[in-house]
């Protein structure tokens, strides 16, 4: 029998630096997590006392803080290659820049292996990108080779902007012939690693023959095994065994996100390459895991940069944005409109003739809004001035809901209406009417939403039973402010970009802002 | 463009050793395994081993384990095979090759003429 | 091992024939099969892998088929620059082994 460990992490989302528990920015040091410098301690640790380990990541180590605005890869590359990572296989975020915004930072200057067997190059790009990502790789671990064959959503097109010249086709389609060809290079260690969530791991665990483990990403899928060490509720065990349609119990595992923990699995083949057992755990990345000196002091070399780049102007406002509590929870307010108009226009994507756009409407948690931007500083808004707006580091994530689902969280938007609460809903892309007379759940007297399959824009009544994409924050896609319905009733939910940088860059596009209060939110008469 | 350039000719005495090196350009040289070969003059092609510089994992072919060492500098992208206790029937060209995506060889080293003569 | 045995050793043939070049493995390689042009002098250039896939900048008068144990490579149409010696190579299983050659001669 031959053991092989495989470390592995997913959905970093540029979290270079250790974070707090809720992964967002890192307070009291004591008690944070994660980071680069932490994680290759623990790697480091594993690989002097076992022999054949492979760190391999998943996708999505793009987008997520100020590390990715300002160095837009080049710190991915950097950090990656440090802690000697040996594949990675290609996320969404990663096109989050265009095809330039990965080939340059990340797959020139990438010391490793990049995957993805469903992407497929064509025109001009072809011959520019040839070479510098593959659909596998072998590598060879002690005296044996392992294959790694990549995945990545087939939804990219949809979440970031890969541009034209990419074709992402079905993972199972197009994972099987490379399987086969591993097979034919007498290679009978195969691990699928990818990038399009939980449920499409399990899938290519059941159909993909010749496929022995599945490492995936994109669904922040927490798996484990015993009592969890943090806060994170694990979705099954792990790793989660999936029997696969020839007969044979394919592990599959994720290790949630953020880098908070370091995915720990082993497993045991026989000499014909065939899994006789799988056993490990997510490996929390705590204070007791001290940082590597030497990698922490390059972080800190690096972060140089990004101090002087939160207080640069990136455009101006001539009107005051107000994101009072006072304004934001009662009624509609223009940093809400503000934030809701970026939202929408990060996510445009024109992938289909018949829509102008794949998705038109926004809703954003007026609790969410924490801090007013006065224009009289010369108009000069700074990133350091959004992030006292958004200094939540959440994201801003694409979901699909039923009209009916929409309808209970505008309910629940009023339902204690006038007691200053966060689950005042702002928008984009919907025009809503309010009655306060009327009793909670039933307050909502019209609502109407932008259509999208329309080559003029304009607005309609909201139907129950169809499908809508919206954009909103990662916060109420998860149920928070008592939006359980979104939670429980969503029926797609993908990760999207960090908020303050959705903000900022559409800010910086327009030069120049003045969103205005502009009856997008209305209550009937004699109510309000 | 990819390219391999190979150290000049060597003539050694029986017994002595001898270290060819094979540096590299226009491509990442951790992502992708070098190969050696030799060929005797007038023979065909026998594969010596590999070196996977993105961990340093090294393959020999049996039948030169114990006198051939394959070794990598990654900051000089260069990789380095050494031969030793050389006799006469190591009178060969011996070629570094890099792979495409593993075990057939794309692109080739000019070759490197290693003579062992008292 | 597996040994790659080559017919025939040499060949002569003339500018626009179709030239035919076998290679037998001693056991199965499925498709694993790659094939290299070396002209006196230089290094070996590889020509086709997976038994049948151009490498870029191979004309197409170059084609391999085959599976399992037989494989070919044929030249449709000969070329002047095309005269060289052959070697195929299973990419199946290490130790990586050639066949021991086909030198292609003008008549």
């Known amino acids: 029998a031959w053991e092989l460990t495989i470390l592995h992490t997913n959905d970093v989302h540029s979290r270079l630096e250790q974070t707090s528990e809720d992964s967002s920015k890192c307070v009291n040091a004591s008690r944070c997590m994660g980071g680069v410098a932490r994680l290759f301690t623990k790697v480091q640790q594993i690989r002097r006392a076992e022999p054949n380990v492979l760190l391999l990541d998943a996708g999505d180590q793009y987008q997520g803080t100020i590390w990715f605005t300002v160095y837009k890869g080049a710190e991915v590359a950097h950090f990656m290659n440090a802690l000697r990572y040996d594949a990675m296989a290609l996320g969404n975020h990663e096109f989050d820049n265009g095809v330039e915004g990965l080939i340059e930072p990340l797959l020139k200057e990438a010391k490793f292996p990049i995957l993805s067997a469903n992407i497929k190059a064509k025109g001009p790009l072809a011959s520019q990108i040839s070479g510098l990502y593959l659909p596998y790789k072998v590598l060879p671990v002690g005296d044996e080779v392992v294959g790694i064959v990549g995945y990545t959503s087939k939804e990219t097109p949809f979440l970031s902007n890969p541009g034209t010249n990419l074709v992402f086709e079905d993972e199972i389609t197009a994972l099987q012939p490379e399987v086969d060809k591993l097979k034919t290079l007498n290679v009978n260690k195969i691990i699928a690693l990818g990038h399009s969530g939980f449920e499409m791991d399990k899938l290519i665990a059941q159909k993909v023959r010749g496929v022995d483990v599945v490492v995936g990403g994109h669904s922040n899928t927490f798996l484990y095994t015993g009592n969890p060490p943090s806060k994170e509720v694990p979705a099954g065990k792990y790793p989660f065994i999936v029997t696969s349609d020839d007969g044979r119990k394919v592990p599959v595992v994720q290790a949630y996100a953020f880098g908070k923990y370091l995915g720990y699995l082993k497993i045991e083949f026989d000499e014909r390459g065939n899994v006789i057992s799988s056993h490990g755990n997510p490996i929390l990345l705590n204070s007791s895991i001290p940082e590597d000196p030497s990698i922490k002091a390059d972080i800190n070399k690096w972060r140089i940069k990004l101090d002087n780049y939160s207080t640069q102007e990136l455009g101006k406002t001539i009107v005051y944005l107000d994101g009072s509590s006072q304004s934001c929870r009662f009624r509609e307010c223009n940093m809400g409109n503000l934030i809701c108009d970026a939202m929408i226009n990060n996510n445009l994507r024109h992938t289909d003739e018949m829509f102008w756009n794949h998705v038109s409407m926004c809703i954003l948690n007026g609790g969410g809004i924490r801090s007013p931007i006065d224009e009289r500083n010369n108009g000069t808004i700074t990133w350091e001035n959004l992030a006292a707006v958004l200094p939540f580091g959440g994201t801003f994530d694409l979901v699909q809901l039923k009209g009916s689902t929409l309808k209970k969280a505008f309910e629940h938007s009023v339902h204690r209406y006038g007691q200053s609460t966060g689950e005042f809903l702002q928008v984009g892309g919907i025009h809503v009417v309010y009655d306060l007379s009327r009793k909670p759940g039933d307050r909502v007297v019209k609502l109407d939403v932008l259509c999208t399959k329309c080559r003029v824009p304009s607005y309609d009544p909201l139907k129950m039973d169809e499908v809508y994409k919206v954009i909103l924050p990662n916060f109420l896609a998860n149920g928070g402010d008592g939006f359980q319905m979104i939670k429980d009733e969503l029926l797609r939910h993908d990760s999207g970009d960090q908020d303050i940088n959705v903000v900022s860059t559409y800010i910086s596009k327009m030069k120049v802002i003045y969103p205005a209060v502009e009856g997008r939110i209305k209550f009937s008469t004699g109510s309000h | 463009q990819v390219q391999l350039v190979q150290s000049g000719a060597e003539v050694k005495k029986p017994g002595a050793s001898v270290k060819v090196s094979c540096k590299t350009s226009?491509?990442?040289?951790?992502?992708?395994?070098i190969y050696w070969v030799k060929q005797r003059p007038g023979q065909g092609l026998e594969w010596i081993g590999w070196?996977?510089?993105?961990?340093?994992?090294?393959k020999y072919n049996e039948k030169f384990k114990g006198r051939v060492t394959i070794t990598a500098d990654k900051s000089a992208s260069t990789a380095y095979m050494e031969l030793s206790s050389l006799r006469s029937e190591d009178t060969a060209v011996y070629y570094c090759?890099?792979?495409?995506?593993?075990?057939?060889?794309?692109?080739w080293g000019q070759g490197t003429l290693v003579t062992v003569s008292s | 091992d597996i040994q790659m045995t080559q017919s025939p050793s040499s060949l002569s043939a003339s500018v626009g024939d179709r030239v035919t070049i076998t290679c037998k493995a001693s056991?199965?390689?499925?498709?694993?099969v790659a094939w290299y042009q070396q002209k006196p002098g230089k290094a070996p250039k590889l020509l086709i892998y997976?038994?049948?896939t151009r490498h870029t900048g191979v004309p197409s008068r170059f084609s391999g088929s085959g599976s399992g144990t037989d494989h070919t490579l044929t030249i449709s149409s000969l070329q002047p620059e095309d005269f060289a010696t052959y070697y195929c190579?299973?990419?199946?299983?290490?130790?990586?082994?050639f066949g021991q050659g086909t030198k292609l001669e003008i008549k």
């Open positions: 090759a890099r792979d495409d995506n593993y075990a057939w060889f794309a692109y």
């Open positions: 226009g491509y990442t040289f951790t992502n992708y395994y």
């Open positions: 070196i996977y510089p993105g961990n340093l994992n090294i």
């Open positions: 056991q199965d390689v499925s498709t694993a």
């Open positions: 997976w038994t049948n």
């Open positions: 190579q299973q990419h199946y299983s290490t130790p990586f082994t």
